[in-house]
Structures are given as structure tokens and as C-alpha cells.
Amino acid sequence: MKVLQEPTCVSDYISLSTCEWKMGGPTNCSAELRLVYQLVFLISETNMCVPENNGAAGCVCHLFMEDMVGADNYTLDLWAGQQLLWKGSFKPSEHVKPKAPENLTVYTNVSETLLLTWSNPYPPDNYLYEKLTYAVNIWNENDPTDSRIYDVTYQEPTLRIAASTLKSGVSYRARVRAWAQSYNSTWSEWSPSTKWYNAYKEPFEKHHHHHHHHHHH
């Protein structure tokens, strides 16, 4: 039994790290392998993760970690029974993939503005709580080319956009993801999307003006 692609791990920097690797051939990951991990510190428990299959030869393990600090370093040992297949280490703060934002809501009743809000997925005592910035993806359900991304580079989990920037009488969807620049993280997964109908109508004067203008041509 041989490891083809060594484990690579990412951490949500709160409680979960996910490691993936590939074996040399078809493997029943949960029956044949164990990933043992331990925080390098005075008082720390040895933990064991039972991997799941990710394809015929791929394995994935969810490592539970608690109370992370920036300097944390974990030893990782991949075992097949009594045989040590691979030995490595993992520093969560250097491989951060934030949790996805939650509770995305779209408010359409704020005059001619769409207000999108979501919640920060971290509690206030977590380092990432004040470090996340966001990207919001809005797209037309019926036209995949009508899609845009708004960068939310401030920390408040809200976005305001003019309803007039979207097509009227069309159903739109939005989703949001997060990243932490200070930890050079990757982007989180997208949040679940939320749907709304853009009922915005152009003001009559503007509509009339456009119509008149068209008539003269």
C-alpha cells in the first residue's frame, strides 16, 4: 500500500481541518487507514481520524482541532494498520480556508436599493472574526451571462446596490463567500444562494423621456 499524492490540509481556523490525499490504487479508506494527529504542545491529546473515500483511490479526513492559536503546529501520521505510510506536519494558520458566510438575506423594500446582509460565520473571540472580507455573486436565473461579482472590502457583512442596475421583472440569485487577507487564506465555499424578484420599475419621467427620444429617431 502506497501514498500517491501526500496529504494536503486546509483549516477553517476554528475547529475543523480537512486533509485529502490519494493512494496508489483503489482503497477502502475507512477500513484500511487512520490519520493520527497531535498538537505540538506540553499538554495535548493524540487524536485519530477515520478517513472517508473521495473517489476510488482518494481519501479525505476531517480533523477536529480546538482553541487554535497562530503558532499551532500538528504532527500527522498516516497509518495502514501497523505500517506508517507517511509522516508530516500541518500549521493551520498557514492554510486557512474560512467557513462560508451564513444567513444571506435580500431586502427589496428599501426604496430603490437592494440590501443584502449575511452573518459572519465566526464568533467574536476568533481571530478571523474581524479579518474577513467578502465577495457577492449576483446572477440572472434565466441568463447565465448576466452575472456580476461585488467585492466587499469592508468588514460589515452588508451590500447595497441600486435596483436599477439589474434588469427589471427578472428573478435573481445571490451568494457570498469570504476570505482573510491577513492570513493569506483561500476563498471560502460559496454560501447557499438566495432568490428574489427584481420588481424595480423605472420612474415614469425617465421612461417617458426615453420613449420620446426614441420617437425622434
Epitope: 475547529s15 506540553l42 499538554i43 480546538e66 482553541d67 492559536v69 497562530g70 494558520s93 467574536p124
Partner: antibody
């Protein structure tokens, strides 16, 4: 052997500032959160706040926001807490504690007396 | 803030007899990572507090097995199966799940 050695007792006048140190040996403070706990005379324990020495990230109980400032110097393996605008009710023993992820190691405490 | 309420506030026990201290939190102290960071500390006279129990039921290294922790949700208990003279002091429960972290008001144990 793990030791958290705090600076000595202080007597300060109202309105003054005091800075207490907590020198750690036996482990690297970057590997833990460093917390501070207040104990007024004859009273119970009160959590004040904490720091992650690696990135300097601090969080405080609202009661101590603006009163306490927690810092850490990883090169000397020392945590600090400064108390400002001292009043008589700040008279207490202050403990530094490392948490990973429970309070396993405590300093001996520093008595700060505020008296005119 | 989560309020931790201990009962009784004082306890007088004959050596060799059991003792029990209750701690109730004003709301759930399950952390977002699924753990319950409920701990028990003993502060002996003239000393700094020392850890007895972490994560509700786990005895810290070197703590005698006469100490045990139990509970879930918002109700937790520390039991001493047979009290010894060296157990005197003030016992505190503590929640480290939600900021601001909070201690109970303490229970003073004396020997009869």
C-alpha cells in the same frame, strides 16, 4: 518545569497607571492564549481578557475594555497587562493564566493596591 | 453575559464523607465547535487556583480520582466521593465557551 512568574506588588495613587508582567518558562507563549483574571480582596474570580501572542489579537470582557490593555513580547516570552485610570475598586490580585484549551498554568498573582 | 450560579456557597463536610457542588449556566455553554468548556477550579488558601476538571468530565493530570464532574446543557456538578483535609478551599466553576468567559461565584468547602 512550567512557571509563570509575575512582577511584584504595586501601590498606586488613584488616576495612575500600572503595568504588570508575567514571565513564562517551560513553554513558548506563542503556543497558547495568555489570559488575565482579577480577584478583588475576599471576592471571586473575574475573567478580564486574553491575547494570542502570535498575532497580538486581544479580546476583553466589556467591563475591562478601556481599563486593561494586554500585550505580549514573544522574544522575552512575557505577557503584560496595563491598567489605566486606577480607582480604589481596581485594588485586587491579578493572575496571568495560560489557556490551551483550559487554565492549566497560573501565575502566583500580583497585588495592586490603589490608595491615596 | 453568561451567568454561572453555584450552590451551595459554603459547605462543611466531615472527612471521608461525600460532597457535591452544583453549577448552573444562564444559557447553553456548548461552543460552536461542539465542545462544552465547563471547568472546575480549586483555590486553596493563599494559593492560585488549580485546574481539577475540564470539558465537564475530564480530570486533569494529577487530580485524585475522588473528584468527578458531570452534567450537560446548563446543569453541572462536581462531586468529591470522600472529602479529605487537603480539599479545603474555594471551588469555582467556569465556562470558556462564550466570550466573555465567566466564573461562578465560588463555593467554600470547610472540614467539620
Amino acid at each position: 518545569e512550567v512557571q509563570l512568574v509575575q512582577s511584584g506588588a504595586e501601590v498606586k495613587k488613584p488616576g495612575a497607571t500600572v503595568k504588570i508582567s508575567c514571565k513564562v518558562s517551560g513553554f513558548n507563549i506563542k503556543d497558547t492564549y495568555m489570559h488575565w483574571v482579577k480577584q478583588a480582596p475576599g471576592k471571586g474570580l473575574e475573567w478580564m481578557g486574553r491575547i494570542d501572542p502570535t498575532n497580538g489579537y486581544t479580546i476583553y470582557a466589556s467591563k475591562f475594555q478601556g481599563k486593561a490593555t494586554i500585550t505580549a513580547d514573544t522574544s522575552s516570552n512575557t505577557a503584560y497587562m496595563e491598567l489605566s485610570s486606577l480607582r480604589s475598586e481596581d485594588t485586587a490580585v491579578y493572575h496571568c493564566v495560560s489557556r490551551r484549551p483550559w487554565f492549566a498554568y497560573w501565575g502566583q498573582g500580583t497585588l495592586v493596591t490603589v490608595s491615596s | 453575559d453568561i451567568v454561572m450560579t453555584q450552590t451551595p456557597l459554603s459547605l462543611s463536610v466531615t472527612p471521608g464523607q461525600p460532597a457535591s457542588i452544583s453549577c448552573r449556566s444562564s444559557q447553553s455553554i456548548v461552543h460552536s465547535n461542539g465542545n462544552t468548556y465547563l471547568e472546575w477550579y480549586l483555590q486553596k488558601p493563599g494559593q492560585s487556583p488549580q485546574l481539577l476538571i475540564y470539558k465537564v468530565t475530564n480530570r486533569f493530570s494529577g487530580v485524585p480520582d475522588r473528584f468527578s464532574g458531570s452534567g450537560s446543557g446548563t446543569d453541572f456538578t462536581l462531586k468529591i466521593s470522600r472529602v479529605e483535609a487537603e480539599d479545603v478551599g474555594v471551588y469555582y466553576c467556569f465556562q470558556g465557551s462564550h466570550v466573555p468567559y465567566t466564573f461562578g461565584q465560588g463555593t467554600k468547602l470547610e472540614i467539620k
